[in-house]
């Protein structure tokens, strides 16, 4: 059956979010510098559950800490300045979850490194894209 235009739009937004998150992950993994060790000391909150678009609230709440860690890196590997990258992500997240959402994010007990955090949200996006296909 043909995919509805609203579903296609959601898929494209998720693809864009995925692209930005993978860019950050790639930039970190390519970062051959002692600062990587320091970046990995920063802890991020992980969602207890992330299976629906409303759960992107949990990602939104961690964008500021993410920007701070990326600023620390001062790397050209990110293709865009951290502020612009995070701004892009914020716009997409708001569009996907809806700005009227009153969802209260529940976080897991254990925190994660930036790499684990990014992997979690990339997996989330890919999973939703797959279910929409």
């Amino acid at each position: 059956a043909p995919t509805s235009s609203s579903t296609k739009k959601t898929q494209l937004q998720l693809e864009h979010l995925l692209l930005d998150l993978q860019m950050i992950l790639n930039g970190i993994n390519n970062y051959k510098n002692p600062k990587l060790t320091r970046m990995l000391t920063f802890k991020f909150y992980m969602p207890k559950k992330a299976t629906e678009l409303k759960h992107l609230q949990c990602l939104e709440e961690e964008l500021k800490p993410l920007e701070e860690v990326l600023n620390l890196a001062q790397s050209k590997n990110f293709h865009l300045r951290p502020r612009d990258l995070i701004s892009n992500i914020n716009v997409i997240v708001l569009e996907l979850k809806g700005s009227e959402t009153t969802f209260m994010c529940e976080y897991a007990d254990e925190t994660a490194t930036i790499v684990e955090f990014l992997n979690r949200w990339i997996t989330f996006c890919q999973s939703i894209i797959s279910t929409l296909t």
Epitope: E15, L18, L19, Q22, M23, L25, N26, N29, N119, I122, T123, Q126, T133
Partner: nanobody, 118 residues
Framework: EVQLLESGGGLVQPGGSLRLSCATS????????MGWYRQAPGKQRELVAV???????NYADSVKGRFTISRDNSKNTMYLQMNSLRAEDTAVYYC????????????WGQGTLVTVSS
């Protein structure tokens, strides 16, 4: 290491056409998702078109009906046919290829400039 190289950009008049190509220096598995995004000065980066490993395509509303994305896995090349070009399509166009499973490798090119002006 895989590298992506875009070509086909240039100066074109409004209403004109261009075909961008994205060639890869190494093997990009047919299962990878590939796409094109563009960056205009002072504007948010825009994802223009995407093609999945299975050939499913998706387009930004701003280019729907005018742009067509395609890929030739045997040549490790992806294309973006751009018709009815407008001034607002002026930007640097980047191609990318990404893994859809961990470790989520992402590759992108250096970009090709498309200028639409009379």
């Amino acid at each position: 290491e895989v590298q992506l190289l875009e070509s086909g950009g240039g100066l074109v008049q409004p209403g004109g056409s261009l075909r961008l190509s994205c060639a890869t220096s190494g093997t990009i598995f047919s299962g990878y998702t590939m796409g094109w995004y563009r960056q205009a000065p002072g504007k948010q980066r825009e994802l223009v078109a995407v093609i999945s490993g299975g050939g499913d395509t998706n387009y930004a509303d701003s280019v729907k009906g005018r742009f067509t994305i395609s890929r030739d896995n045997s040549k490790n090349t992806m294309y973006l046919q751009m018709n009815s070009l407008r001034a607002e399509d002026t930007a640097v166009y980047y191609c990318y290829s990404r893994e859809v499973t961990p470790p989520w490798k992402l590759y992108w090119g250096q970009g090709t400039l498309v200028t639409v002006s009379s």
